[in-house]
């Protein structure tokens, strides 16, 4: 039975040109994390795995930097990063748990930081 | 106190295989990731591999592929590596070191195991 | 693959004093340096790791810096017990790729 929740930064908003750090965190279970991967819609941003270290994709690495820890920093930042992102942890022997972060990348300087949530 | 302990020195002919073994005491074996590393003539490190003894997963350097092949026995927490067709490119000291979960930096080395290949 | 190149190869100097070591990678491995010490006929022991973390038991004499592309080891003060091979290693990702390696002897 899955009894983990990721904890996620929630709906976050930056400055275009700016970085941000997306970040997630699985609590409430044993369960061993084997892999992390980060995505946004369909595509696959980055892989963090327990032995074989980080892979950035190719197109993002001029704009992606691993870490904090299994986060992922986004610089750089454009409108057109405007969007859902998703932690996908694998993990065993529970299986696979997502968290979704909405960033929002606004032009103007009244960029705020939403609230932490939770995702069952 | 953590210990990885190896085989001792083996003297092989060309084209034959070995098998070295690295024990683990004093930790949790499948808690952490085993790897193997080649050292030449006392030289610098190359890394061969690495083995996850809980899952059974492998990855190998694409240098070693072929050469090198990574096992580990859950029962008497013992990794093992066989290198296959040997020549004297394949004389050198190799290592076992763990490395721990998301910690990709070997934290404890093995005693070391000399190979040396020669008819 | 990342390569490590480290220098200088080799390096004379007394007890007491303070030598630097120094590691480039071909790209950016961030902080995911690690460095290794090994006396003749022993196994590595891990110095470093993360660029600058020290694990315990390794003297405070021992420091390490750098991210991205450029990493160095600094030794205050050196002991007689320092005297061996020193390694860099990137742990960022697969292929794990080390330095040519340093020889710092006794002058």
């Known amino acids: 039975m899955m009894t983990g929740t990721i904890e996620t930064t929630g709906n976050i908003s930056a400055e275009k040109g700016g970085s941000i750090i997306l970040q997630c965190h699985l609590s409430s279970t044993t369960a061993q994390v084997t892999q992390v991967n980060w995505e946004q819609q369909d595509q696959l941003l980055a892989i963090c795995n327990a032995d074989l270290g980080w892979h950035i994709s190719p197109s993002f690495k001029d704009r992606v930097a691993p870490g904090p820890g299994l986060g992922l920093t986004l610089q750089s930042l454009t409108v057109n990063d405007t969007g859902e992102y998703f932690c996908i942890y694998h993990t065993y022997p529970d299986g696979t748990y997502t968290g979704r972060i909405f960033l929002e990348v606004l032009e103007s300087s009244v960029a705020e930081h939403g609230a932490r949530f939770q995702i069952p | 106190e953590f210990q990885l302990q190896q085989s001792g020195p083996e003297l092989v002919k060309p084209g034959a295989s070995v098998k070295i073994s690295c024990r683990a005491s004093g930790y949790s074996f499948t808690a952490y990731s085993m790897n193997w590393v080649q050292q030449t003539n006392g030289k610098s490190l190359e890394w061969i591999g690495v083995i996850n003894p809980k899952f059974g997963t492998i990855n190998y350097n694409q240098k070693f592929k072929g050469k090198a092949t990574l096992t580990v026995d859950q029962s008497s927490s013992a990794a093992y590596i066989q290198l296959n067709s040997l020549t004297s490119e394949d004389s050198a000291v190799y290592f076992c070191a763990r490395n721990g979960n998301f910690a990709w930096y070997f934290d404890v080395w093995g005693t070391g195991t000399t190979v040396t290949v020669s008819s | 693959d990342i390569q490590m190149t480290q220098s200088p190869a080799s390096l004379s100097a007394s007890v007491g004093e303070t030598v630097t070591i120094t590691c480039r990678a071909s790209e950016n491995i961030f902080s995911y340096l690690a460095w290794y010490q090994q006396k003749q006929g022993k196994s590595p022991q891990l110095l470093v790791y993360n660029a600058k973390t020290l694990p315990e038991g390794v003297p405070s004499r021992f420091s390490g810096s750098g991210s991205g592309t450029q990493f160095s080891l600094k030794i205050n003060s050196l002991q007689s017990e320092d005297f061996g091979s020193y390694y860099c290693?990137?742990?960022?990702?697969?292929?794990?790729?080390f330095g040519g390696g340093t020889k710092l002897e006794i002058k």
């Open positions: 290693q990137h742990h960022y990702g697969v292929p794990w790729t």
